[in-house]
């Protein structure tokens, strides 16, 4: 028997992936466990193997189809179960009725690039990845810029309250190395959370022209 508290959290990327984390105090180290997804109104079901990510938590990704295919809609409810092997049978360790579009976490933005850089400003663009056509333009973004001598945690957050896949960073210091990250969140979903941060984009502002005021 397993004692202790269990937490089972999943997010849908809005297209064809449900990522789950299962945490269990006093957990079974050498037991094989999996997540099983059973939609209420689809002909398919899906399973993934839970792999350890820390002492007492496991994670896996349910791949529902091709990355950009719309495998679930807002009407679907998916029964998600954690099943662990006990001898010759499987035991249900956790279960939830999962509303995919109430529990969204999109993929991190991709293809970050510097569109134009000057001494004091830099224009950066990006793309969203595997985001449902359902959202239309109703997405928001957060961005942050890493300045020399600071940490990401200290970087102020810039909020873009609409689907705007570019930003113009102002009041930068000439001839200085920066890094930039962005993340995305749909407005839809009670338990929706921010995507992971994008891979950092490194850029350098242009040096100030000699003999000129900057």
């Amino acid at each position: 028997a397993v004692n202790g508290t269990s937490q089972f959290t999943c997010f849908y990327n809005s297209r064809a992936n449900i990522s789950c984390v299962w945490s269990q105090d006093g957990a079974l180290q050498d037991t094989s466990c999996q997540v099983h997804a059973w939609p209420d109104r689809r002909r398919w079901n899906q399973t993934c193997e839970l792999l350890p990510v820390s002492q007492a938590s496991w994670a896996c990704n349910l791949i529902l189809g091709a990355p950009d295919s719309q495998k679930l809609t807002t009407v679907d409810i998916v029964t998600l179960r954690v099943l662990c092997r006990e001898g010759v049978r499987w035991r249900v360790m956790a279960i939830q009725d999962f509303k995919p579009f109430e529990n969204l976490r999109l993929m991190a933005p991709i293809s970050l690039q510097v569109v134009h850089v000057e001494t004091h400003r830099c224009n950066i663009s990006w793309e969203i990845s595997q985001a449902s056509h359902y959202f239309e333009r109703h997405l928001e973004f957060e961005a942050r810029t890493l300045s020399p001598g600071h940490t990401w945690e200290e970087a102020p957050l810039l909020t873009l309250k609409q689907k705007q896949e570019w930003i113009c960073l102002e009041t930068l210091t000439p001839d200085t190395q920066y890094e930039f990250q962005v993340r995305v969140k749909p407005l839809q979903g009670e338990f929706t959370t921010w995507s992971p941060w994008s891979q950092p984009l490194a850029f350098r502002t242009k040096p100030a022209a000699l003999g000129k005021d900057t």
Partner: antibody
């Protein structure tokens, strides 16, 4: 500019079938959802269903499920709503609208359907 | 299905004054509530999504708020073009349902 232009008014006899068209422009029809909404005289709005042109799926409200069929022709950027076994209480204005699944962002001008013997 | 109840059925307000329209859900719908405006002979127009998010192009005098299952649409200073019927709509439980509407008329 987003536009949804619906076909003209219809007069039908009880038991007949009506088919309304909704020609769209100004957005990618193949990646859109088109909803249909009924507004009967003196009554509120009633959501009937949608077609998801990208996924190729339809959803219908239970109250209309047995009698409504929503289709789309992506070659002409036109959606259709067919309502069968018409009765007098189906006399209403019918709207097509574009949106995500959750709300309706842009609406057609409406098509009046009168059911009378 | 979820029943959406709007109150009052008719609201009489003078131009320049504030109007407060209410929409109550028969069960918890999180923030999945959207507001529309409909003028006579016209199609509805989307105003507010998710209880409080304004749609671009909608004047700033329109705002939304939520307290539990009760949602409020506030028009801070009524203009002549604001007199219309207002509908709320929930998208929490399928099928989506609308309120019966509040008619906002000139006092």
């Amino acid at each position: 500019e987003v536009q949804l232009v619906q076909s003209g008014a219809e007069v039908k006899k009880p038991g007949a079938t009506v088919k309304i068209s909704c020609k769209v422009s100004g957005f990618n029809f193949k990646e859109s959802l088109i909803h249909w909404v009924q507004q009967a005289p003196g009554k509120g709005l009633e959501w009937m269903g949608w077609i998801d042109n990208e996924a190729g799926e339809t959803e219908y409200a239970p109250g209309f499920q047995d009698r409504v069929t929503i289709t789309a022709d992506t070659s002409t950027d036109t959606a259709y709503m067919e309502l069968s076994s018409l009765r007098s209480e189906d006399t209403a204005v019918y709207y097509c609208a574009r949106g995500g699944p959750w709300f309706l962002s842009y609406w057609g001008q409406g098509t009046t359907v009168t059911v009378s013997s | 299905e979820i029943v959406m109840t709007q109150s009052p059925a008719t609201l009489s307000v003078s131009p320049g004054e504030r109007a407060t329209l209410s929409c109550r859900a028969s069960q918890i719908i999180s923030n999945n509530l959207h507001w529309y405006q409909q003028k006579p002979g016209q199609a509805p127009r989307l105003l507010i999504i998710y209880g409080l998010q304004s749609i671009s192009g909608i004047p700033a005098r329109f705002s939304g708020s939520r307290s539990g299952t009760e949602f409020t649409l506030t028009i801070s200073s009524l203009q002549s073009e604001d007199f219309a019927v207002y509908f709320c709509q929930q998208s929490n439980n399928f099928p989506w349902t609308f309120g019966q509407g509040t008619k906002l008329e000139i006092k």
